[in-house]
Structure formats: structure tokens, C-alpha cells
Interface confidence: low
């Protein structure tokens, strides 16, 4: 059919929940283009009807609510005006047994559900909720094992969790939730979240500091070959990871066909206090597909991305 | 839409039992918790029983624990409760409700009242 494959994306939900996958994939995505969303492979496009339990809201597949059997491949075609783009989502749902605890919880949690709070400080826990437009989230309630997080040391702030002097205590599951509208009626989002505990102070009060990439764009010709180091100082005992991600996957999987971009060795230089780690990022032909998509780099609880863009054109050629 | 329908509501005497259902169409409740409230005249609403995880989880307030069992059909559709043993001071009009929190404090025991949807009720009197 003349599209290119561009990557898997792998979703594990919840049953009951409502649940939205935007298909975004800039720089593409970013022009004049049209999508449309397909189930395992159909010809039939998903219904763009807004009172259908699955439709189509502009560029996002909205499920009101998932529902058992809606486990699956999804495709988003993405056609531009010479081009034509195809993601592919793999949605995995569950029954999740919020309350009963003799019942397994949430099985391979991405990094959305599992979130870290430092001891002894002021940290906070986000409640990752990604809607389209039609969407209304009410207030979000957070819960600690079933139980309305409630007490001074706990802040409610827009979509976080605010936890001031935080104990070993607080590590357990939370969940939020929130009452999502949509067209008049009314749906419970839950997301549950496994909290731990870490005791390292870190090295500059921070852990860990990534010292590059600083969240910046880098500009870079089409078909070059571009390596770029993403550099961090942690505490000489640490056990955090050092990656490099696009779309919440791991380069080396997102890429595994290909291989076209890969994350290089880690390195590491010991100094007194601190370690200095460097693990790079190799883009061994920088293709259109590139640009404007953020290339993150990953070190514990910290993040730093890079975003390549074309060099602006050199009228003085001409 | 969203509908609760209950029935199976009457009057019994002391000792009797009664079982009611919910037909609940126009919404999935595979996560969610459904249950029964209560509310008497010029009393306040009272949370009787509610059923969640696909009836792994149940929750009972002591006023009718041991006397009153909720359950659910297959298809998650119907909620039941049956009412035995009963006794004057379960004279209430009894709604079901759905689209709770099953994390909220209604589905296990609490006082909160976290539904998104509720029936029109269904009136128990127990009474010689």
C-alpha cells in the first residue's frame, strides 16, 4: 500500500477506563496531513461518530470506556501530500483489581506508573492523563492502598501529588483519579502508581544531573552522520540506568530493524565525590523522520532531550 | 444513556427477606463498583453493600452484615442484593448506583458518596 512502518508502540490498560492514543509524529504530523485509525488491519476505517464507544477525535482514537475485547493492534495512517506514515499501537487490557491486593497489580509497568520520592525531602508524584480536547478531567483525587490521601504534608496541585518531608512510609500504591466528561456522560480514569523510596542525597542536590543535552535543538544536514553524548554526574554508589529513548522506547528497540540509530557503550570517569557517566547516541544517516521528534536522554528519575532541525538555508550560496 | 433500574422492592414482615436487583444498561462496570445505598425519612443516606472487581471484593456496613448478600450476574449487568432477617429499622427507599470509585471510600466502607450514576430507588418496609 505504499506506506512506510514507522514503529510499534505497546500499551498495557485497564479495563473499563477510558483510554486515548494520540497519533503524533512530528515533523510529519506537523504539515498538512490527514490520519485515520484502523483496527488489526481492517479496511474500515474507526467510526468518527462521537457517540461510538471507539471513534476517531481529530488525530487521537478515543475508547469510552476500553473494554475487554478491544485488546489489538490499532493502526494510524498519516498521509501527507507525497507521503504516507503507518503506526502501529499493540493495546493489551486487563482486569486490574484495584482494591484487592491477594490479586496480581499492574503487570510491566511503564515508567508513567512507577515513580520515585526522595527521603527527607519535597517531592511530588504526577498523574499522567492524556486526552483530546473533548475531554473534560475533573478534579484528581490521589489514594494511598485504597485510602483518600488526606493530612498537611500532602498538596494537591493540578495534575501532582505534593508530598513535603517524604518518609519511608510513603512508599507503597497510590493511584489518581479523576471523573472524565465526554458528550455528557461520565467515566472514572484511574492510574495506579507504585512508589518507592530512595535515600541518596545525590551529587549537587540533585539525582542525577544530566549535564548534556540541556533540552535544546540541534541543527544538522539530512543524510549526516551525528553522534551526541549525553552526559551525567550521579553519587559513586548509584544503581540508576543511563539510556536513550524516543517515544517512551529504547532507541536500540525502536530502532531494532534498522539499527540506523543506535545508544553507544556507557562510559564513566570516577572523581571524588561523583561519577561522570556518558553514553551516546549515534545516528548513523539522519533521515527527514528525525527532525523535530525529542531524543531523550534518561538517567534515573532525570531527563534531558535533544530535538535535530534543519539548518536554516544559507542565501549567501546563491 | 446510563440506566439503573431496581426492583423487587415491597413490604414483609420482621424476619422476612426480599431480594432486589439493579438492571444496569448503557455503561461498563467491569472495574467499577456497583452497590446499594439507603436512605430513610429524614435520616441519612446510608452505604449497605457494594460489589467491585468483578465480585472479588465485597463490602458489607455493619448495620446488615451477615443479614444482607450483594452479588452480580455473569455479565456484570444485574446487581443483586437479598435481604434477610430483616427488621423495622431496614425501612429505607434503597437505590443502586454505579460509575463509583473503587477506590473511593464508598466501595469499602466509608462515608463518602462517589457515584457517577444512581437509580430512583426502590421502597422496603418492614413492619407487623
Known amino acids: 500500500d505504499g506506506c512506510k512502518d514507522i514503529f510499534m508502540k505497546n500499551e498495557i490498560l485497564s479495563a473499563s477506563q477510558p483510554f486515548a492514543f494520540n497519533c503524533t509524529f512530528p515533523p510529519i504530523t506537523s504539515g498538512e496531513v490527514s490520519v485515520t485509525w484502523y483496527k488489526n488491519s481492517s479496511k474500515i476505517p474507526v467510526s468518527k461518530i462521537i457517540q461510538s464507544r471507539i471513534h476517531q477525535d481529530e488525530t487521537w482514537i478515543l475508547f469510552l470506556p476500553m473494554e475487554w475485547g478491544d485488546s489489538g493492534v490499532y493502526q494510524c495512517v498519516i498521509k501527507g501530500r507525497d507521503s504516507c506514515h503507518r503506526i502501529h499501537v499493540n493495546l493489551t487490557v486487563f482486569e486490574k483489581h484495584w482494591c484487592d491486593t491477594s490479586i496480581g497489580g499492574l503487570p510491566n509497568l511503564s515508567d508513567e506508573y512507577k515513580q520515585i520520592l526522595h527521603l527527607g525531602k519535597d517531592d511530588s508524584l504526577t498523574c499522567h492523563l492524556h486526552f483530546p480536547k473533548s475531554c473534560v478531567l475533573g478534579p484528581i483525587k490521589w489514594y494511598k492502598d485504597c485510602n483518600e490521601i488526606k493530612g498537611e504534608r500532602f498538596t494537591v496541585l493540578e495534575t501532582r501529588l505534593l508530598v513535603s518531608n517524604v518518609s519511608a512510609e510513603d512508599r507503597g500504591n497510590y493511584a489518581c483519579q479523576a471523573i472524565l466528561t465526554h458528550s455528557g456522560k461520565q467515566y472514572e480514569v484511574l492510574n495506579g502508581i507504585t512508589v518507592s523510596i530512595t535515600e541518596r542525597a545525590g551529587y549537587g542536590g540533585s539525582v542525577p544531573k544530566i549535564i548534556y543535552p540541556k533540552n535544546h535543538s540541534i541543527e544538522v544536514q539530512l543524510g549526516t552522520t551525528l553522534i551526541v553524548d549525553c552526559n551525567v554526574t550521579d553519587t559513586k554508589d548509584n544503581t540508576n540506568l543511563r539510556c536513550w529513548r524516543v517515544n517512551n522506547t529504547l532507541v536500540d528497540d525502536y530502532y531494532d530493524e534498522s539499527k540506523r540509530i543506535r545508544e553507544g557503550v556507557e562510559t564513566h570517569v570516577s572523581f571524588r565525590e561523583h561519577n561522570l557517566y556518558t553514553v551516546n547516541i549515534t545516528f548513523l544517516e539522519v533521515k527527514m523522520e528525525d527532525y523535530g521528534l525529542p531524543f531523550m536522554c534518561h538517567a534515573g528519575v532525570s531527563t534531558a532531550y535533544i530535538i535535530l532541525q534543519l539548518p536554516a538555508p544559507d542565501f549567501r550560496a546563491y | 444513556d446510563v440506566q439503573l433500574v431496581e426492583s423487587g422492592g415491597g413490604s414483609v414482615q420482621p424476619g422476612g427477606s426480599l431480594r432486589l436487583s439493579c438492571a444496569a444498561s448503557?455503561?461498563?462496570?467491569?472495574?467499577?463498583?456497583l452497590g446499594w445505598y439507603r436512605q430513610a425519612p429524614g435520616k441519612q443516606r446510608e452505604a449497605v453493600a457494594t460489589?467491585?472487581?468483578?465480585?472479588?471484593?465485597?463490602y458489607y456496613s455493619d448495620s446488615v452484615k451477615g443479614r444482607f448478600t450483594i452479588s452480580q450476574d455473569n455479565a456484570r449487568t444485574t446487581v443483586y442484593l437479598s435481604l434477610t432477617s430483616l427488621k423495622p429499622e431496614d425501612t429505607a427507599t434503597y437505590y443502586c448506583a454505579a460509575g463509583l470509585s473503587v477506590l473511593g471510600s464508598w466501595c469499602h466502607g466509608g462515608s463518602s458518596y462517589e457515584y457517577t450514576y444512581s437509580g430512583q430507588g426502590t421502597q422496603v418496609t418492614v413492619s407487623s
Open positions: 448503557g455503561y461498563s462496570y467491569r472495574t467499577q463498583c
Open positions: 460489589i467491585s472487581g468483578g465480585g472479588t471484593s465485597t
